[in-house]
């Protein structure tokens, strides 16, 4: 007979998830309403398209990007969707409570949904480091803690450092990466004998992971421009992101070949490195004045990504127990940092040019923002990791890591693997 959830989890998961969903429905009932103002319908549709792009990125892009494991592809895609659906609901409420609750009700607009989808994307980036080692009940905890931590981080940053939605959301890369890595660090690491094959990639799942990468590649300009307030800024952000990801694809494929003794191209390198440029230009995508600069950044980001994919997995596998193909965590941690550093460099160049002490002060503020994002990510990640280690969640046994059969019903399989 195929393996099942342990009986206790079978009781715990539906109860936990459905109770939470009921609580969310009640919160929506008492505290939210739609923005009922008269609006131009054509404008509304255009605005919705950005949200749609973000949802495609999250559900298909990140869902499939994490599906390259030989025996964990179903769970990767479906668990991602589950987390996205839950994360968006909680993020809408949280953001409303933090930013507009004094007025009595949270007004839900298309922008709220856009913002919430981006917050939920943070969880989907982080979870790459732990997928296969946790069950759905644990993932619910991770969603709630991470969305709450990110929402509070954004609110603190906007109030203390006076940043707009775009700037404080662009910390998502660094935040999500360090959050995921710190959660992974807390989870049981060594893979027992006989399970090594499960965290290997297979051809068909790798193809679906490439499909995920393609969807992310296509829609990354929408992600980087989604929260900018003026058409001029959005247009610039779209162009620069497009140039950066275009160059990072070329760099990823050629750099991957260069990094291999026989000149072969690694699927794993390519999956992540094609996105490198988009992450690296994220923070300053609207500030870069010309294509060549965005292209240079895409090139640098692609090289860093390939280099990281070559040398970091060994370290990550030993220290954090992250499998070789789960490279989003360290990839985003490096590239997110690169993006933040690029923005700080732009401010430093301003200081040099203007000799203005106030610009120097802005550099310090930006470093403060970045440090705060990393600290909160690490602290909330460690807290989540400790929570996930509690016996109450009935985590999968190490021997059942990266195994779809633990979670899914496969009628055609009479016996376990």
């Amino acid at each position: 007979m195929s393996s099942k959830y342990p009986r206790s989890v079978r009781r715990c998961l539906p109860l936990w998830a459905l109770t939470l969903e009921a609580a969310l429905i009640l919160l929506f009932y008492f505290f939210t309403h739609y923005d009922a103002s008269l609006e131009d319908q054509k404008g509304l549709v255009a605005s919705y398209q950005v949200g749609q792009d973000l949802t495609v990125m999250a559900a298909i892009g990140l869902g499939f990007l994490t599906s390259s494991f030989r025996r964990h592809s179903w769970s990767s895609v479906a668990f991602n969707l589950f987390m996205l659906a839950l994360g968006v609901q909680w993020a809408i409420l949280l953001d409303g409570f933090l930013s507009q609750f004094p007025s009595g009700k949270v007004v839900i607009t298309l922008f709220s949904i856009r913002l919430a989808t981006m917050s939920a994307l943070s969880v989907l980036i982080s979870v790459d480091a732990v997928l296969g080692k946790v069950n759905l009940a644990q993932l619910v905890v991770m969603v709630l803690v991470e969305v709450t931590a990110l929402g509070n981080l954004r609110m603190v940053i906007s109030n203390i450092f006076n940043t707009d939605y775009h700037m404080n959301m662009m910390h998502i890369y660094v935040f999500a990466a360090y959050f995921g890595l710190s959660v992974a660090w807390c989870l049981p690491k060594p893979l027992p004998e006989g399970t090594e094959d499960k965290d290997q990639t297979a051809t068909i799942p790798s193809l679906s992971a490439m499909l995920g990468a393609l969807f992310l590649w296509m829609f990354w300009p929408s992600f980087n421009s989604a929260l900018l307030r003026s058409p001029i800024e959005r247009k610039n952000a779209v162009f620069n992101t497009y140039y950066a990801v275009a160059v990072s694809v070329v760099t990823a494929i050629s750099g991957s070949s260069l990094a291999h003794p026989q000149g072969k191209i690694s699927k794993t390198y390519v999956h992540s490195a094609v996105l490198a440029g988009g992450v690296a230009v994220g923070t300053s995508c609207h500030l870069i004045p010309s294509p060549w600069l965005a292209m240079v950044l895409g090139l640098v980001a692609g090289l860093i990504s390939v280099g990281g994919a070559k040398y970091l997995p060994g370290c990550c596998n030993r220290v954090l127990g992250i499998p070789h193909s789960s490279i989003m965590g360290y990839n985003f941690s490096l590239l997110g940092l690169l993006g933040e550093i690029i923005y700080i460099v732009l401010l430093v160049l301003d200081t040099v040019g203007a000799g203005n002490g106030m610009i120097g002060f802005q550099v310090l503020l930006s470093i403060g923002e970045l440090s705060l994002a990393i600290v909160i990510a690490l602290m909330s990640g460690l807290l989540t990791g400790l929570l996930l280690n509690l016996k109450i969640w009935k985590a999968p046994h190490e021997a059942k890591y990266f195994d779809d059969q633990v979670f899914w019903k496969f009628p055609h399989l009479a016996v376990g693997f």
């Epitope: 923005d35 609006e39 131009d40 404008g43 509304l44 255009a46 605005s47 950005v50 930013s99 507009q100 607009t109 298309l110 922008f111 856009r114 906007s158 109030n159 450092f161 006076n162 940043t163 707009d164 939605y165 700037m167 404080n168 307030r229 003026s230 058409p231 001029i232 800024e233 610039n236 300053s284 609207h286 500030l287 870069i288 004045p289 600069l293 732009l346 160049l349 301003d350 040019g353 106030m358 610009i359 002060f361 802005q362 503020l365």
Partner: antibody
């Protein structure tokens, strides 16, 4: 000629509602964020609300949050302010203003400038019993 | 919520130079606050003079200039003319949740 013309003001009793309109002409309305600003008699300017160019995002001053709603119809080049549960302290001249975003560039970065560069002449709202 | 503070009133002689300042309760004002300056004469709508710290609009007279001084936004009027007598408002752009705050205004008197 770039122009904003407010209308809909008048005398209203406390607790009642009023809807202000602002008709825009002479510029591409759909690419500009729009603000409402008010000025009570003998007082300074007070920012009331802003709506992004595509209507996707709105912000309000704490003093009007939950009572006022800003909206726009880009097909009609018109900005609105729906004012509910009016109070005596809402008595003011209400101006609509266009937010202009311009930029300059150095070799390595763009600098954006936000400013309310076009204002209407204002419409007076008096809340009195 | 942030509070933006200006001098309530200043007096200057014709031909003189005067500097109006604009401070934020949240700390030092930087270019990221996009300081704006407006001039308002009695019975008229406000007229923008400066955007983004120091950028003049096409109609702004050359004697008006914007800058950052000691953690505040500043508007300097050199060679003051009698027609410069008005109330001057500064505006700062914040992040979220309240993105725009006006100062209380400075009444400039030209004697």
């Amino acid at each position: 000629e770039v122009q904003l013309v407010e209308s809909g003001g008048g005398v209203v009793q406390p607790g009642r509602s009023l809807r202000l309109s602002c008709a825009a002409s002479g510029f591409t309305f759909r690419t500009s964020a729009m603000h409402w600003v008010r000025q009570a008699p003998g007082k300074g300017l007070e920012w009331v609300a802003v709506i992004w160019y595509d209507g996707s995002n709105k912000y309000y001053a704490d003093s009007v949050k939950g009572r006022f709603t800003i909206s726009r119809d880009n097909s009609k080049n018109t900005l609105y302010l729906q004012m509910n549960s009016l109070r005596a302290e809402d008595t003011a001249v209400y101006y609509c203003a266009r937010e202009m975003v311009s930029y300059s560039s150095s070799w390595y970065r763009r600098y954006y400038y936000y400013n309310m560069d076009v204002w209407g002449k204002g419409t007076t709202v008096t809340v009195s019993s | 919520q942030a509070v933006v503070t200006q001098e309530p009133s200043l007096t200057v002689s014709p031909g003189g130079t005067v500097t109006l300042t604009c401070a934020s309760s949240t700390g030092s004002v930087t270019s990221g606050y996009y300081p704006n300056w407006f001039q308002q004469k009695p019975g008229q709508a406000p007229r923008p003079l400066i955007s983004g710290t120091s950028n003049k609009l096409s109609w702004t007279p050359a004697r008006f200039s914007g800058s950052l001084l000691g953690g505040k936004a500043a508007l300097t009027v050199s060679g003051v003319q009698p027609e410069d007598e008005a109330v001057y408002y500064c505006l700062l752009y914040y992040g979220v949740p309240q993105p725009v705050v006006f100062g209380g205004g400075t009444k400039l008197t030209v004697l």
